[in-house]
């Protein structure tokens, strides 16, 4: 970090490596909860037009797919992988792809994925074997 850039008081926000260059935050789809038409598919696009800069450099991209008697929703956000989301640990937070894993929730079907590549939560994958042929 050049001397004229003040050292941050908040070490969570000011992350740097040994070379002194400041670590960038991730860019993720961030539409919160939206109604979705994604159902019974091996993969889906988020159809979220908002790509946000995550608030902190260690946050990753997250997608949450939920289906109940009334509707299907897809949630896209940034989140700290050290913290739970909807009560669940973010698995595979270092993955370049957002591969959905089912979570046990009463009254709904609930899938969640996390990933750490730009806009990786724009393309959500429900089928593990599909990951090899998915676009970069």
């Amino acid at each position: 970090i050049p001397p004229h850039v003040p050292k941050s008081v908040n070490s969570d926000v000011m992350a740097s490596d040994n070379g002194g260059a400041v670590k960038l935050p991730q860019l993720c789809k961030f539409c919160d909860v939206r109604l979705s038409t994604c159902d019974n598919q091996k993969s889906c696009m988020s159809n979220c037009s908002i790509t946000a800069i995550c608030e902190k450099p260690h946050e990753v991209c997250v997608a949450v797919w939920r289906k109940n008697d009334k509707n299907i929703t897809l949630e896209t956000v940034c989140h700290d992988p050290k913290l739970t989301y909807h009560g669940f640990t973010l698995e595979d937070a270092a993955s370049p792809k957002c591969v959905m894993k089912e979570k046990k929730r009463a009254g709904e079907t609930f899938f969640m994925c996390a990933c750490n590549m730009e806009e990786c939560n724009d393309y959500i994958i429900f089928s593990e074997e599909y990951t090899t042929s998915s676009p970069d």
Partner: nanobody, 124 residues
């Protein structure tokens, strides 16, 4: 030598507007994603906005989305930040920064050059 020189900061009333500029030299401007980053007094860095080198695709922090507009003029090697509907919480030193080339992995993404910064004060 890489240089980034910001200008356009100053004192503005809440609800007012400012346009920041960042003149870049010493590297091929059209090859790099550029960022505006700010640091409020006593706070950490906040990544405000970014713009792709070609095609002008833009990204914003949720705190400024809809109020700030990033742009660039590749013919002038200049980066801009139009700030509207300014609030007291926008008070900060604003830096432009050049992203290092590399993969799209967070673990490998870094800034390697910064400007000196320009102070924006929003107060009545």
């Amino acid at each position: 030598e890489v240089q980034l020189l910001e200008s356009g900061g100053g004192l503005v009333q809440p609800g007012g507007s400012l346009r920041l500029s960042c003149a870049a030299s010493g590297f091929t401007f059209t090859e790099y994603r550029m960022w505006w980053v700010r640091q409020a007094p006593g706070k950490g860095l906040e990544w405000v906005s970014a713009i792709e080198p070609i095609g002008n695709r833009t990204y914003y922090a949720r705190s400024v989305d809809g109020r700030f507009t990033i742009s660039r003029d590749n013919s002038k090697n200049t980066l801009y930040l139009q700030m509207n509907s300014l609030r007291a919480e926008d008070t900060a030193v604003y830096y432009c920064a050049k992203q290092m080339p590399g993969q799209k992995w967070m673990a490998k993404s870094r800034f390697d050059y910064w400007g000196q910064g320009t102070l924006v004060t929003v107060s009545s």
